[in-house]
Interface confidence: medium
Amino acid sequence: MEEGGDFDNYYGADNQSECEYTDWKSSGALIPAIYMLVFLLGTTGNGLVLWTVFRSSREKRRSADIFIASLAVADLTFVVTLPLWATYTYRDYDWPFGTFSCKLSSYLIFVNMYASVFCLTGLSFDRYLAIVRPVANARLRLRVSGAVATAVLWVLAALLAMPVMVFRTTGDLENTTKVQCYMDYSMVATVSSDWAWEVGLGVSSTTVGFVVPFTIMLTCYFFIAQTIAGHFRKERIEGLRKRRRLLSIIVVLVVTFALCWMPYHLVKTLYMLGSLLHWPCDFDLFLMNVFPYCTCISYVNSCLNPFLYAFFDPRFRQACTSMLCCGQSRCAGTSHSSSGEKSASYSSGHSQGPGPNMGKGGEQMHEKSIPYSQETLVVD
């Protein structure tokens, strides 16, 4: 499901004639089962995130909310295609859904791969502005700026994924009974120039879809951690426990993103390098066989994000509880307005409203009064 297609064996006669490649041994029901689990958790989790964000009143939403909503939409659009890929994998790579769905579902996967990565980056940068430079960049974080940034990231994601829409097709590659959904470069490339397309798309997707965003995220969280550490140094010793928890949340975010996407991009990059460096056959074959599992792990990220970004916030949990309770008579004691108030916006993790240290719309005006007491991930 990557942009690239085949660049094994076409290129480098030595590789082709000496390495004993064989048909990929199917994982059976394992990968399809994981895809379906990600689909179920992803639709539920991201659906809850969207519900929580959009049920809050407009004035109580913060700049981060637009990224959180976008991230949830991206992940949601991503995971709804997974039943198709689960079916395809389970049928031992036989695509029964037609060319249009092959193109569209492949395209949606990549639009939303980019979009979700960009959303995480936007959210990280928003956290950076909120925590490290809250005064100087308060205007940058207005809802209008957030909307513009979101529009840009979606357009960029849509454009970056376009090669998938163009080159994906279905084909009975050997006039056998199976139909594959694959990348076909024959309209633009000869065998010799296929390599350039493969490397170009592979390198660009890894650079733009992983290396650059991850570098930005890492940089943002480095400064965030530095700022938090600075704040806690000024506070009393009881703050140490809070500091550890908050820093661990940030570490979890970055590490989870890395753990989910690193294997995919690393294996892909090593494989591309193999055509230049001529890895031993066993290693080349290992990369080929491990790649579907790396893809699977990267897809898991789309159902983890709601848990990582929302479930650390007690208000999100309250909102979920109130939603579950709404349909049950035993919860009638909880007033609707109260539950609505409590779940206002899970990105504003304050126990108080805009107080003396708050600017217009609840923006923080003094660095030293950042309310970490909620230990919420997306604190404003």
Partner: antibody, heavy 129, light 107 residues
Framework: EVQLVESGGGLVQPGGSLRLSCAAS????????MSWVRQVPGKGLEWVAN????????YYVDSVKGRFTISRDNAKNSLYLQMNSLRAEDTAVYYC??????????????????????WGQGTTVTVSS | DIQMTQSPSSLSVSVGDRVTITCRAS??????LGWYQQKPGKAPKRLIY???SLQSGVPSRFSGSGSGTEFTLTISGLQPEDFATYYC?????????FGQGTKVEIK
């Protein structure tokens, strides 16, 4: 050294049967698709059949479908061609050959056939009364 | 079935000459074509696969090109050991089909 050695050819009457064997050495036989190709003396080459590594997929040219059966024994590093209901037009030199495929890294299940890279010396089958 | 038509069926050339053999497919076969060399009493030997990829150990004077329905094998600077019969093979779909062959003879 990679080697394929065919055996089992000979003279047979029309309607008769023959079983060709191909012994493989010098490579991991179980990792490759294998083919049979024939050549009528003084004429061109004709692909006959091929078989997947585990024997789960087999393909034949229309002229031999229902009469010829390709099979393999990976434990013995051997490929076979069972020929039944033989006709005069089946007279040919039969070559056993190793198939090569390119496999898509990204699109699992997609493979590209690259022809036959190693051939045996051939075994002659003559169908005559 | 895809029909493969080779031309010429034979040609007489001298050592050092440039030789071009053409293979036409009855329908589009992308880049799925190979070239084989066969000497009398010997098994065929693969020269080129996937239109232009050179088999390991094959001299660089052999090259392939083309796409879709028209393909070419070029031998730049024919050597004495190159006098043989050359076949194209489409490996796009089943059944695999060979061209009828081109015999390259000494002038």
């Amino acid at each position: 050294e990679v080697q394929l050695v065919e055996s089992g050819g000979g003279l047979v009457q029309p309607g008769g049967s023959l079983r060709l064997s191909c012994a493989a050495s010098g490579f991991t036989f179980s990792s490759f698709w294998m083919s049979w190709v024939r050549q009528v003396p003084g004429k061109g080459l004709e692909w006959v059949a091929n078989i997947k590594q585990d024997g789960s997929e087999k393909y034949y040219v229309d002229s031999v479908k229902g009469r010829f059966t390709i099979s393999r024994d990976n434990a013995k590093n051997s490929l076979y061609l069972q020929m039944n209901s033989l006709r005069a037009e089946d007279t040919a030199v039969y070559y056993c050959a190793r198939d090569r495929f390119g496999y898509s890294f990204y699109d699992k299940g997609v493979r590209y056939y690259y022809g036959m890279d190693v051939w045996g010396q051939g075994t002659t089958v003559t169908v005559s009364s | 079935d895809i029909q493969m038509t080779q031309s010429p069926s034979s040609l007489s050339v001298s050592v050092g000459d440039r030789v071009t053999i053409t293979c036409r497919a009855s329908q589009g076969i992308r880049n799925d074509l190979g070239w084989y060399q066969q000497k009398p009493g010997k098994a065929p030997k693969r020269l080129i696969y996937a239109t232009s990829s050179l088999q390991s150990g094959v001299p660089s004077r052999f090259s392939g090109s083309g796409s879709g329905t028209e393909f070419t094998l070029t031998i730049s600077g024919l050597q004495p050991e190159d006098f043989a019969t050359y076949y194209c093979l489409q490996h796009n779909s089943y059944p695999r089909t060979f061209g009828q062959g081109t015999k390259v003879e000494i002038k």
